[in-house]
């Protein structure tokens, strides 16, 4: 679809409210350092333009394709190689390349502060006094700290975001409405962006073939009375989506995915049962909704799948004809037919399938070779199945933060290379699978836990990235995407690691743990607990946990206190000797 | 939620004028773009005009520029669609709708209106 001014055409439809968003959230992503005041400076600078190109296509740069405008726009910055460094070689480059540089640039883990929440009379008086400042502030604070998170999703966070504002600012009790709702929003957005962050990665490292085997599968577990032709639109629209979006086209990414909705909305009849009431809803909360769309029923009397890919004759011919065609059909039925599966067990199981054909068609004897291929998916099944039963009765015998605290030293113990604050987020997410996962019903588990775990294991792997420190998180990472979680399951204790030397300093704490957040406080303890086992790999459970119980007897001793601070050093000192002793360090 | 209820239209001969109304109610009408939409005896609805919620942009159909003025009164709750110059092929039943921004998809629209017919006589 060629039009003489890609910008007018965007910008017509999508709308100068749309438009100005998404162009300060693409801004944001790339330059995840620039003052908010520079961002909405950009922003208004190219709107403006925008709008000249709307009264005439024909106006001067208006021809220009928006990786060349917006790039040129983030190359005017003045402090680019101070701020950003090498990333500034980029605006040495022509488009494509200069975007793929600015792309292989975006920082999952960028230098920023923390937010701080203000007080709810602050942020209320912030919200009343410029409401478009106040919301656009968020879209940037959001899309500064996380890269990928998928921008018209973000639309519709903001829009909640606007309305928690909205009521609670008017509420009786402003803080009791609100912060319930900002809790959420953050948890939500947390959650959100790791997904979405997976998806980037699916495409970005392993190529588009894997994120529709994905979408394939997933789409297929969630609408498995559609045909399959109807889920292989469904899956080239979605991955079209995604491609544009993790590519940094997030005008384009937008429109598409309101488009993807209405066709869906459209066509509910020939998709899921599922979807009426998401279809009447307005559009960002539509998209949001179908997104999360529970399974449809499973048609009744599904025939076996035998039939079709072992037993006919016609197996290796329908296979040679069109190779991605035929394995995408044996995904689209084996999914339907699995809900209770995980989509990663479900790509293990495809990809088994596929292994066997091209072993066996290439055979004298090609049926009799993968006669018994089926049977070969029972160790691949059984395996996530136990590991999950064996993983919640530990959680349902610790609870979550003992859960998650056995998990940091089974990390730990098997990348122990890899940096404490990294460590200590991903076992902390690792360990919400117990509290996410084990209270389904055994039918619910596996997609629940293995594909949540493929989430996290995801943030590792690209945190691990940035600055890579272990071989065998390299491995694991880059092998296959969806057999991370088998390979890191697989970790044993890392006999080449050295360990840390003692230093007493990471073993100090003050008076102001005691004011912390529970939360908060358990990271500090958990943050200990890494460190300990790094000191001393070989530390068994017992040792470690003696030592984590006084150490939470000690925080709990000189939180109560007269003098804190004395207290913390002084029982500190006895402590850190106790520990040593403890486990002979 | 909010509600939208269009007013204004009717017969009119060719060349003369009519003013279309939109008054909103429920959620707040400022915080919404707001666009007009028309749909004649089987077509497909068309895009007219559309403008931004803070009234700054407004954008119009190639067919209608020059002849149709969009506007609205936030503190009235209200949108306007002055038609001038109007022509046998602006007979249709137009809507007004509202949505999150000024497009001229009718897909970023959420809340719509009933319709008003405008029948212009040749």
């Known amino acids: 679809d060629a039009h003489k001014s890609e910008v007018a055409h965007r910008f017509k439809d999508l709308g100068e409210e749309n438009f100005k968003a998404l162009v300060l959230i693409a801004f944001a992503q790339y330059l995840q350092q620039c003052p908010f005041e520079d961002h909405v400076k950009l922003v208004n600078e190219v709107t403006e333009f925008a709008k000249t190109c709307v009264a005439d296509e024909s106006a001067e740069n208006c021809d220009k394709s928006l990786h060349t405008l917006f790039g040129d726009k983030l190359c005017t910055v003045a402090t680019l190689r101070e701020t950003y460094g090498e990333m500034a070689d980029c605006c040495a480059k022509q488009e494509p390349e200069r975007n793929e540089c600015f792309l292989q640039h975006k920082d999952d883990n960028p230098n920023l502060p923390r937010l701080v929440r203000p007080e709810v009379d602050v942020m209320c008086t912030a919200f009343h006094d410029n409401e478009e400042t106040f919301l656009k502030k968020y879209l940037y604070e959001i899309a500064r700290r996380h890269p990928y998170f998928y921008a018209p999703e973000l639309l519709f966070f903001a829009k909640r975001y606007k309305a928690a504002f909205t009521e609670c600012c008017q509420a009786a009790d402003k803080a009791a409405c609100l912060l319930p709702k900002l809790d959420e929003l953050r948890d939500e957005g947390k959650a959100s962006s790791a997904k979405q962050r997976l998806k980037c990665a699916s495409l970005q490292k392993f190529g588009e073939r894997a994120f529709k085997a994905w979408a394939v599968a997933r789409l297929s577990q969630r609408f498995p009375k559609a045909e399959f032709a109807e889920v292989s639109k469904l899956v080239t629209d979605l991955t079209k989506v995604h491609t544009e979006c993790c590519h940094g086209d997030l005008l384009e990414c937008a429109d598409d995915r309101a488009d993807l909705a209405k066709y869906i909305c459209e066509n509910q009849d020939s998709i899921s049962s599922k979807l009426k009431e998401c279809c009447e809803k307005p559009l960002l909360e539509k998209s949001h909704c179908i997104a999360e769309v529970e399974n449809d029923e499973m048609p009744a009397d599904l025939p076996s799948l035998a039939a079709d890919f072992v037993e006919s004759k016609d197996v290796c011919k329908n296979y040679a004809e069109a190779k991605d065609v035929f394995l995408g059909m044996f995904l689209y039925e084996y999914a339907r037919r699995h809900p209770d599966y995980s989509v990663v067990l479900l790509l293990r199981l495809a990809k088994t399938y596929e292994t066997t054909l091209e072993k066996c068609c290439a055979a004298a004897d090609p049926h009799e070779c993968y006669a018994k291929v089926f049977d070969e998916f029972k160790p691949l099944v059984e395996e996530p199945q136990n590991l999950i039963k064996q993983n919640c009765e530990l959680f349902e015998q610790l609870g979550e933060y003992k859960f998650q605290n056995a998990l940091l030293v089974r990390y730990t113990k098997k990348v122990p290379q890899v940096s404490t604050p990294t460590l200590v987020e991903v076992s902390r997410n690792l360990g919400k699978v117990g509290s996410k996962c084990c209270k389904h019903p055994e039918a619910k588990r596996m997609p629940c836990a293995e594909d949540y775990l493929s989430v996290v294991l995801n943030q590792l792997c690209v945190l691990h990235e940035k600055t890579p420190v272990s071989d065998r998180v390299t491995k694991c990472c880059t092998e296959s995407l969806v057999n991370r979680r088998p390979c890191f399951s697989a970790l044993e204790v890392d006999e080449t690691y050295v360990p840390k030397e003692f230093n007493a300093e990471t073993f100090t704490f003050h008076a102001d743990i005691c004011t912390l957040s529970e939360k908060e406080r358990q990271i500090k303890k958990q943050t200990a607990l890494v460190e300990l086992v790094k000191h001393k790999p070989k530390a068994t459970k017992e040792q470690l946990k003696a030592v984590m119980d006084d150490f939470a007897a000690f925080v709990e001793k000189c939180c109560k206190a007269d003098d804190k601070e004395t207290c913390f050093a002084e029982e500190g000192k006895k402590l850190v000797a106790a520990s040593q002793a403890a486990l002979g360090l | 939620e909010v509600q939208l209820v269009e007013s204004g239209g009717g017969l009119v001969q060719a060349g003369g004028s009519l003013r279309l109304s939109c008054a909103a109610s429920g959620r707040a009408f400022s915080s919404y773009a707001m666009g007009w939409f028309r749909q004649a005896p089987r077509k497909e609805r068309e895009f007219v005009a559309t403008i931004s919620l803070s009234g700054g942009y407004t954008y119009y159909a190639d067919s209608v520029k020059g002849r149709f003025t969009i506007s609205r009164d936030n503190a009235k709750n209200t949108l306007y669609l002055q038609m001038n110059s109007l022509k046998p092929e602006d007979t249709a039943v137009y809507y007004c709708?509202?949505?999150?921004?000024?497009?001229?998809?009718?897909?970023?629209?959420?809340?719509w209106g009933q319709g008003t017919q405008v029948t212009v006589s040749s």
């Open positions: 709708a509202a949505g999150e921004s000024s497009s001229r998809q009718d897909k970023w629209y959420d809340y």
